[in-house]
Interface confidence: medium
Amino acid sequence: TQNKALPENVKYGIVLDAGSSHTSLYIYKWPAEKENDTGVVHQVEECRVKGPGISKFVQKVNEIGIYLTDCMERAREVIPRSQHQETPVYLGATAGMRLLRMESEELADRVLDVVERSLSNYPFDFQGARIITGQEEGAYGWITINYLLGKFSQKTRWFSIVPYETNNQETFGALDLGGASTQVTFVPQNQTIESPDNALQFRLYGKDYNVYTHSFLCYGKDQALWQKLAKDIQVASNEILRDPCFHPGYKKVVNVSDLYKTPCTKRFEMTLPFQQFEIQGIGNYQQCHQSILELFNTSYCPYSQCAFNGIFLPPLQGDFGAFSAFYFVMKFLNLTSEKVSQEKVTEMMKKFCAQPWEEIKTSYAGVKEKYLSEYCFSGTYILSLLLQGYHFTADSWEHIHFIGKIQGSDAGWTLGYMLNLTNMIPAEQPLSTPLSHSTYVAHHHHHHHHHH
């Protein structure tokens, strides 16, 4: 007779990534007895919540409960009922909510409060909802990709898990692009981190890491586009804005009130003698690139070297994983292959942006027009940000790996966040016996979460 399989001794964790444009729920699973090992936690499910980011619910907080229902119900189905009560749930909100908090602390609190009340209605172990800092977002993204790549493991393998994995223990840098912010995080080579705000110290699995990180608020792809439009309409002095970042023949009416709604456009705000203007695409990569560069102030730098806007950036070092929108956009444009040089990417972008809008709509009939229309801008923005913003070159471009998933888990900050909050990244090399909490990593961003 066949042996009956023993019940798996596994644990689950849930993290909700409340981004500026949407919310995603991730379910992670790991063997209970191996929770201190590196690389054992993996993602079993991603559920994308239908609708915008939570910051958009500021005037309709009563709809937040319904908004979260489908994905929370999905979590109920995926995770065995017997595990529900011990499955932690964390919600981390990023730059969309940081911007809302800048506008009004009270409104941001109101949104988070309703989110917390909604999530505490489920049978899981809800650990709270909070706005994570840009530094945390960068740090946890870095932890995620290096954890998944096996960089923290002391056992060097003779085989590679993933095509871009190098067989050494040098960590990968992390490049994260969201809708409202972008993060750059890496271990510089013997370089003093001249700005304390950008320095993180970790001890992970018995090794010390001095990590550089910075989050550029307002430089996510969506907010960068709003910035660019606000900058350009200042000069246009007309109700028509001929825009090189949109395909020839593309037209869209924009409300000035929408343009000035975000704190990101405040520096360009002026009294315009019209309430609306029309974007008319002219599809010119080079001109789009030039326009984007005006968003980066490179004339001021109080350090040995800067990215832009006076923010310290050490010399780039090693390989980088570029994920989130860096990946989604480049994947759409079919530019994620390791073999595609920076010159080739630029060439492809020139061709893509110059394609007439009607042609683009026909070629990508299944793609929502709102998203489709912005790929020319987003692709050009990615190139501008990486080359002029972060000072990658045609040569160092080869060290950027556009990553969607590693070993089936999405690259992003959520896994690193959960590993830290569940104390699953030990500061010292795990022994055969479980360690006390005191030996776990506790870098200076570890906030205690309240239980409901």
Epitope: E239, I240, R242, P244, I282, N284, Q287
Partner: antibody, heavy 119, light 107 residues
Framework: QVQLVESGGGVVQPGRSLRLSCAAS????????MHWVRQAPGKGLEWVAY????????YYADTVKGRFTISRDNSKNTLYLQMNSLRAEDTAVYYC????????????WGQGTTVTVSS | DIQMTQSPSSLSASVGDRVTITCRAS??????LIWLQQKPGKAIKRLIY???TLESGVPSRFSGSRSGSDYTLTISSLQPEDFATYYC?????????FGQGTKVEIK
């Protein structure tokens, strides 16, 4: 092809009025902002006034503010400059030029029409 | 108002010479500058926009560049048809302002 043709210039006494026209063809006039620019004899170019495509925006140089009015008739593809209380220093060749950010900023100009203010 | 200081006001050069004309902006204009060419009896012609973008149909011997608040028009090898007056114009704010002009004459 794009054409801008100014007319309405002439000799006029100080204090009197004159209306200049600029007839546009070869492009979608109603999409473009339009400028008037002038050049006094032997001098450089001086910007005078601007009107947006839908006439909702008008800008004037301080030297003509309150005396000159820019207007347009999109159905007739025509730009106008109504000049009142003319002074000797308004004597110049007046040019119209089209404007559309990003790539069509003052990219086509007319040949100009001469206005002489003299008693 | 933004002042555009153009220099030189005139220059004499020979065919084949390299010629540079500079405009300095009194305030930040962020590259919003065009270069114009004026010849007697002809319509004014735009050569360069956005400080460095060459108008289609304009010979490649013309180029525009920027260094801080200084904007330069360069004619790499002067041709007989290039003898004219050149103006810069800023379009970052109103009132639009021109440089004083540079007359390029035959030596």
């Amino acid at each position: 092809q794009v054409q801008l043709v100014e007319s309405g210039g002439g000799v006029v006494q100080p204090g009197r009025s004159l209306r200049l026209s600029c007839a546009a063809s070869g492009f979608t006039f109603s999409d473009y902002g339009m400028h008037w620019v002038r050049q006094a004899p032997g001098k450089g170019l001086e910007w005078v006034a601007y009107i947006s495509s839908g006439s909702s925006i008008m800008y004037y140089a301080d030297t003509v503010k309150g005396r000159f009015t820019i207007s347009r008739d999109n159905s007739k593809n025509t730009l106008y400059l109504q000049m009142n209380s003319l002074r000797a220093e308004d004597t110049a060749v007046y040019y119209c030029a089209r404007d559309l950010y990003y790539d069509h900023v003052l990219d086509y100009w007319g040949q100009g029409t001469t206005v002489t203010v003299s008693s | 108002d933004i002042q555009m200081t153009q220099s030189p006001s005139s220059l004499s050069a020979s065919v084949g010479d390299r010629v540079t004309i500079t405009c300095r902006a009194s305030q930040e204009i962020r590259g919003y500058l065009i270069w114009l060419q004026q010849k007697p009896g002809k319509a004014i012609k735009r050569l360069i926009y956005a400080a460095s973008t060459l108008e289609s149909g304009v010979p490649s011997r013309f180029s525009g560049s920027r260094s801080g608040s200084d904007y330069t028009l360069t004619i790499s090898s002067l041709q007989p048809e290039d003898f004219a007056t050149y103006y810069c114009l800023q379009y970052t704010s109103y009132p639009r302002t021109f440089g004083q002009g540079t007359k390029v004459e035959i030596k």
